[in-house]
């Protein structure tokens, strides 16, 4: 906190300009007044201010607008944005994408702070959905932004948002938030033909049911290892060996290097395992032939 | 986090010249502008003169023409080169960067200038 003191003569400051870095704390607190300032903030990310002269300009803003800053203000915070806590932030009505392009930009570069996360947070409530252009921006500036939305976050996202999302997007999302995009995706994706649906719904197949599995073993689709290996385990399961060979086509012989990891391991349990030697890869570990499986509510049963 | 380390302060007489280092290290990539401040003993640090990152330079009237601040990139070093130094310009003189999301400091050079 600065002391209140009276300015020394002469030194009123008329406009915000460059003059303003060479003033003391105590001068820019009995100098520079909140009105002028909020009217010229648009200057002040041009001026090399250190971040204790910015303390004293937010303590100025602060005063001047004590239940939070109006948009017009807000816009033109620059690195002042960087002074803000997320108590600030939570008083704020931010409604343009372009006031939080601006103040994303202040940030790039760097992990998501907690002031960012309070930005978007306070956004994407105001706008009651996260549409495709704020979309297409957060993923800008944050590639793992979608699979930091939890699943009931996520469900606030509609299917034509899902264009905006990059295959690395989706990196880090675990099964649960892929649970609640797939379906998005498929829904914005119908109307692609077979390989152009194939390119576009691949990163999201996570999520994919059995029934999805088998229509895309169907289609020619020649799925990677990589892929593979991220689908559900319950939604692999039931794929029958020739389905599981039409699914990956050439990357089959994948199936080797992967067998002691799910989800290899546990459909290869449950494959008879002359049919795992039809794939000619030496694959172990599937019911012995001339056995019976049944399935007793969930439980398997070895007879 | 940026680190930084001041050297070439020391005792000369009225008229002379003495040049600042400021050695930088670590996170460089973020800093936005450098200065030179100085401090008195019982006064509040004041800006002596700035450089930023695409080379501007800012001077504190009172030592307007006499002060230059100049970086060289290749070395990640700031200097500020003093003539016609004044028995005023006695202080501990600090480098500071400013950089994402907040101001580093040097631990400050002392320069005494006698008459």
């Known amino acids: 906190e600065v002391e209140k003191t009276a300015c020394p003569s002469g030194k009123k400051a008329r406009e915000i300009d460059e003059s303003l870095i060479f003033y003391k704390k105590w001068e820019l607190e009995a100098c520079v007044d909140a009105a002028l300032l909020a009217t010229q903030m648009d200057r002040v990310n041009a001026i090399p201010f250190t971040y204790e002269q910015l303390d004293v300009l937010k303590h100025k803003l602060d005063e001047l607008y004590p239940q939070g800053y109006p948009e017009s203000v807000i816009q033109h915070l620059g690195y002042l944005f960087l002074k803000m806590s997320p108590e600030d932030i939570r008083k704020w009505n931010v409604t343009s994408l372009e006031t939080l392009k601006a103040l994303l930009e202040v940030n790039k570069g760097h992990e998501m702070s907690p002031q960012v996360a309070t930005l978007i947070d306070r956004f994407v409530k105001g706008r009651g959905q996260l549409d495709k252009d704020t979309l297409d921006t957060l993923t800008a500036f944050y590639p793992g932004y979608l699979c930091s939305l939890s699943p009931e976050e996520l469900s606030s996202v509609p299917p034509s948002s899902i264009w905006a999302v990059r295959p690395q997007d989706l990196d880090t999302c675990d099964p649960r938030q892929l649970d609640v995009l797939y379906p998005k995706a498929r829904l914005a994706f119908q109307n692609m033909n077979g390989s152009e649906y194939f390119v576009k719904i691949q990163s999201f197949l996570g999520g994919a049911p059995t029934e999805d599995l088998k229509a895309l073993s169907q289609q020619n689709v020649s799925m990677d290892l990589a892929t593979f290996m991220k689908l559900r385990t319950d939604a692999v399961l039931p794929l029958t060996v020739a389905e599981v060979q039409k699914l990956l086509g050439p990357h089959v012989e994948g199936l080797k290097a992967e067998e002691r990891h799910r989800p290899v391991r546990d459909w290869i349990l449950r494959q008879r395992q002359d049919d795992l030697d039809t794939l000619g890869l030496g694959l172990q570990g599937g019911i012995p032939n001339g056995y019976l499986v049944l399935d007793l509510s969930m439980q398997e049963a070895l007879s | 986090e940026v680190q930084l380390v001041e050297s070439g302060g020391g005792l000369v007489q009225a008229g002379e010249s003495l040049r600042l280092s400021c050695a930088v290290s670590g996170n460089i990539g973020s800093i936005r502008h450098m200065g030179w401040h100085r401090q008195d003993p019982g006064k509040e640090r004041e800006l002596v003169a700035t450089?930023?990152?695409?080379?501007?330079?800012y001077y504190a009237n009172f030592v307007k023409g006499r002060f230059t601040i100049s970086r060289d990139n290749a070395k990640n070093t700031v200097y500020l080169q003093m003539n016609s130094l004044k028995p005023e310009d006695t202080g501990v003189y600090y480098c500071r960067a400013t950089a994402h999301p907040t101001d580093y400091w040097g631990q400050g050079t002392q320069v005494t200038v006698s008459s």
């Open positions: 450089i930023t990152t695409v080379g501007t330079t």
